[in-house]
């Protein structure tokens, strides 16, 4: 029969940035879960369950939500999928549907900008309303004559403004700001009206740098994001830009002579104060600001599917890292879980006492901070089972060495844990100096003799029922070394046979293993120096061929059956040539 299990997400919705002017007619938010029986699906928008009726703009296709002809007014918001089956319910991560737009620049003519040749100048972009952020370029006189990003020109990707550190005659002309919006499946660009740059008489005076495009006093960034700091100065001669981390050195891969400092994938080590210095022959100017690195939640410890016995206690734990420190909350079958009688919710810990069948279901721990939310899911299956030995019966034939000790496990599947009794034949066994039943149900018999032979039955019982399993204890002769290896002194290149003979119970296989200084000897190594005698089962002689100095040491012969073993040692000294 098919195993029953609760929903496990295979596909979850992703946030979508939908262009308001898109020709696309629909948005698809994905959701698919593996479950047995198969899952059914529901969706929430902004925390409220959606009515997904035939013929409406919202359609359920498999588990996916399809929104036809989406509009910002009706459809922008937070979406979440719920997958359910008879075992329980899980909720997906939240997906945000946002609408991107970029309006046109103002149709008004732009005022001319005047500056003395040789001075610095800034041309404002004043981009139109938009979402999300834009990238910027500037056009001089005609398309596609874009302003180069050289040391004299700088286009801020924060404001869109164009900075010229020191103007010259070639800068005369008409300037237009090109703003571009990048969305999930479209790109849109708009141009501003042209603004004329007029240059007055040349001023050849040298002047010290003055930083005009400056990065903020505080820049917040998430681990893994790219961080860009901007710094550009007016000055004559054109200032050189240098960057440094006030509390440490910059990573060598960073370009330190550019107006932008880029950290491709920021980490916590990158947090700190950064300084930009603009310098020329007339002086210097500096600006400082901090990068503050934060992080979305990430799991350090999650819950996993658990089978637990009815009446037992269970403690589940979730832990998440992140900055700010994430809070952890719990859901049962998609609904918030709070402390109540047998269930205690303590932040990252969930504790059950005296589990009951109703506690079965799908559980999720949710970690969140202002940068994101993550979900970990697991199924709790509370079991009530009569003892069952089918998976783990008592060993059918239990060989034991005379005079030795035997452990016979009794491990039926049972919930709650079964109470175990052992019998030999029809006699119930009680603990004695020689016979012990451990708390986990294992039967231990010490100093075994022939009289211990017979049928041993483990009886297991709980409130659900009872079962038993029987094994036959067979007492075998102990293994003994009858001819032990003798210590020897040999010369380099000699051959030596170390004898090892054993007696054992003939109903068992006997294996010989040899070790040198407690390391197993490999007889199958091609071109090796060791050979093993194979003429008779009870003989395990070892021959060393062409002995080398490394073959000296403590040799141990172990004779082993499935019930016991015996071993003896000998020391071999290999002498090298004199001197």
């Amino acid at each position: 029969s098919q195993t029953t299990f609760g929903p496990v997400f295979e596909d979850q919705p992703l946030s979508v940035l939908f262009p308001e002017e898109s020709t696309e007619e629909q948005v698809l938010l994905a959701c698919r879960a593996r479950a047995s029986p198969p899952a059914t699906y529901r969706w929430k928008m902004n925390g409220t369950e959606m009515k997904l009726e035939p013929g409406s703009r919202h359609q359920l296709v498999g588990g996916n939500l399809v929104i036809m002809n989406p509009t910002k007014a009706q459809d922008a918001g937070v979406y979440q999928c719920l997958a359910s089956n008879p075992v329980g319910t899980v909720v997906s991560r939240e997906a945000i549907l946002r609408f991107g737009f970029l309006q046109e620049f103002s149709k008004e003519e732009r005022d001319p900008v005047k500056a003395h040749e040789g001075w610095g100048v800034m041309l404002p972009c004043n981009p139109p309303a938009h979402y999300p952020g834009l990238s910027y370029r500037w056009l001089l006189n005609e398309f596609p004559n874009f302003i180069p990003t050289d040391g004299r020109h700088f286009v801020s990707q924060t404001t869109g403004n164009l900075y010229i550190a020191r103007t010259n005659a070639s800068d005369l002309g008409n300037y237009s700001c090109l703003a571009t919006s990048h969305m999930d499946f479209s790109t849109k660009s708009v141009f501003s009206k042209f603004a004329q740059l007029n240059l007055a008489a040349e001023d050849t005076r040298l002047f010290a740098p003055s930083i005009k495009a400056r990065f903020p006093a505080e820049t917040y960034a998430l681990v893994g994001q790219q961080v860009t700091l901007e710094c550009f100065a007016f000055g004559n001669p054109v200032p050189r830009i240098k960057w440094r981390k006030v509390d440490g050195s910059l990573s060598p891969q960073w370009t330190t002579a550019e107006p932008t400092l880029q950290i491709p994938s920021v980490s916590f080590e990158d947090e700190g104060t950064y300084e930009c210095e603009a310098e020329n022959s007339k002086g210097r100017d500096t600006v400082q600001g901090r990068i503050i690195v934060q992080a979305q939640p990430e799991w350090l410890k999650v819950i996993s599917d658990t089978e637990a016995d009815i009446g037992s206690n269970l403690r589940w734990g979730c832990a998440a890292a992140g900055k700010p420190r994430p809070t952890v909350r719990w859901l049962r079958n998609g609904e918030p879980l709070a402390s109540q009688n047998r269930v205690e919710v303590l932040a990252g810990d969930l504790r059950f006492s005296k589990l009951s069948l109703e506690d079965s279901g799908m559980y999720q721990c949710v970690a969140e901070n202002k940068h994101g939310t993550i979900y970990a899911s697991a199924e709790l299956a509370v079991q009530a089972l009569a003892p069952d030995f089918r998976l783990n019966p008592v060993r059918r034939l239990i060989p034991a060495a005379r005079g030795g000790e035997i452990l016979i496990p009794c491990q039926p599947r049972a919930a709650p844990k079964a109470v175990v009794l052992w019998s030999k034949g029809t006699e119930i066994l009680v603990n004695s100096s020689r016979v012990t039943v451990t708390p986990d149900g294992t039967l231990i018999i010490r100093n075994i003799s022939r009289s211990d032979e017979g049928k041993y039955t483990c009886f297991a019982e709980n409130f659900m029922g009872k079962a038993n399993s029987t094994g036959i204890l067979s007492v075998r002769d102990a293994t003994k070394i009858t001819l032990a290896p003798s210590s020897a002194d040999i010369n380099l290149g000699d051959n030596l046979t170390l004898q090892c003979h054993a007696s054992h119970d003939p109903t068992m296989d006997l294996t010989f293993t040899w070790t040198l200084d407690d390391f197993p000897i490999d007889f199958d190594k091609p071109g090796g120096h060791y050979r093993r005698t194979n003429v008779k089962e009870t003989i395990g002689d070892l021959t060393i061929l062409n002995a080398q100095l490394r073959h000296g040491g403590k040799y141990t012969c172990m004779a082993q059956t499935v019930v016991d073993s015996a071993s003896k040692e000998a020391t071999v000294l290999v002498r090298g040539p004199p001197g």
Partner: antibody, heavy 120, light 112 residues
């Protein structure tokens, strides 16, 4: 020297009965674990039954309820009583002296086998 | 039941050349006592089976050292370093981890 000699095979009609014997020498049957293994013509090996030194018996599902393993300690002989024989029981039947393993035991020393043919 | 799968089922080999037979079990053959209950048998034409290897790699007494067994868990190999004429026959792997004990289908070794 350990020796096992099977006898009692032959041609038998479906539904009929047959008793196979295995005479042992060089060891005592009663203090050992003894089994029967069969091999259909041109096919592989199939374990049939085992008897432990203490007298406990076990059978393959395919023969359970139809075959009985037993021994005569005085004759140092192992038997396999086969009833309600079917065409698929046609095989060479080997008697074997076992050694202890996790499953209980396994056949190690084998007789030469005796052929049982079930056919109408 | 534990299923034993051998490959190849037929193995033509030149005299003096090596031969290798693979055996895979449907579950691990390691028992709780630490032993691995995998065995190899040889059946020469017209003869009864004879055990060659016990517990994966131990040769039975009288078995030539050109036969070797290796492997662990569920994958095992019988190797013959240099095939001789007397090695012709069918080779079976067998598990004794669980009842019923089960055999592989057999690999027929023949001389090219």
């Amino acid at each position: 020297e350990v020796q096992l000699v099977e006898t009692g095979g032959g041609l038998i009609q479906p539904g009929g009965s047959l008793r196979l014997s295995c005479a042992a020498s060089g060891f005592t049957v009663s203090s050992n674990y003894m089994s029967w293994v069969r091999q259909a013509p041109g096919k592989g090996l199939e374990w049939v039954s085992v008897i432990y030194s203490g007298g406990s018996t076990y059978y393959a599902d395919s023969v359970k309820g139809r075959f009985t393993i037993s021994r005569d300690n005085s004759k140092n002989t192992l038997y396999l009583q086969m009833n309600s024989l079917r065409a698929e029981d046609t095989a060479v039947y080997y008697c074997a002296r076992d050694r202890i393993a996790a499953a209980g035991t396994l056949p190690v020393y084998w007789g030469q086998g005796t052929l049982v043919t079930v056919s109408s | 039941d534990v299923v034993m799968t051998q490959s190849p089922l037929s193995l033509p080999v030149t005299l003096g050349q090596p031969a290798s037979i693979s055996c895979r079990s449907s579950q691990s053959l390691v028992y709780s006592d630490g032993n691995t209950y995998l065995y190899w048998f040889q059946q020469r034409p017209g003869q009864s089976p004879r055990r060659l290897i016990y517990q994966v790699s131990n040769r039975d007494s009288g078995v030539p050292d050109r036969f070797s067994g290796s492997g662990s868990g569920t994958d095992f190999t019988l190797k013959i370093s240099r095939v001789e004429a007397e090695d012709v026959g069918v080779y079976y792997c067998m598990q004794a981890l669980e009842t019923p004990i089960t055999f592989g289908q057999g690999t027929r070794l023949e001389i090219k």
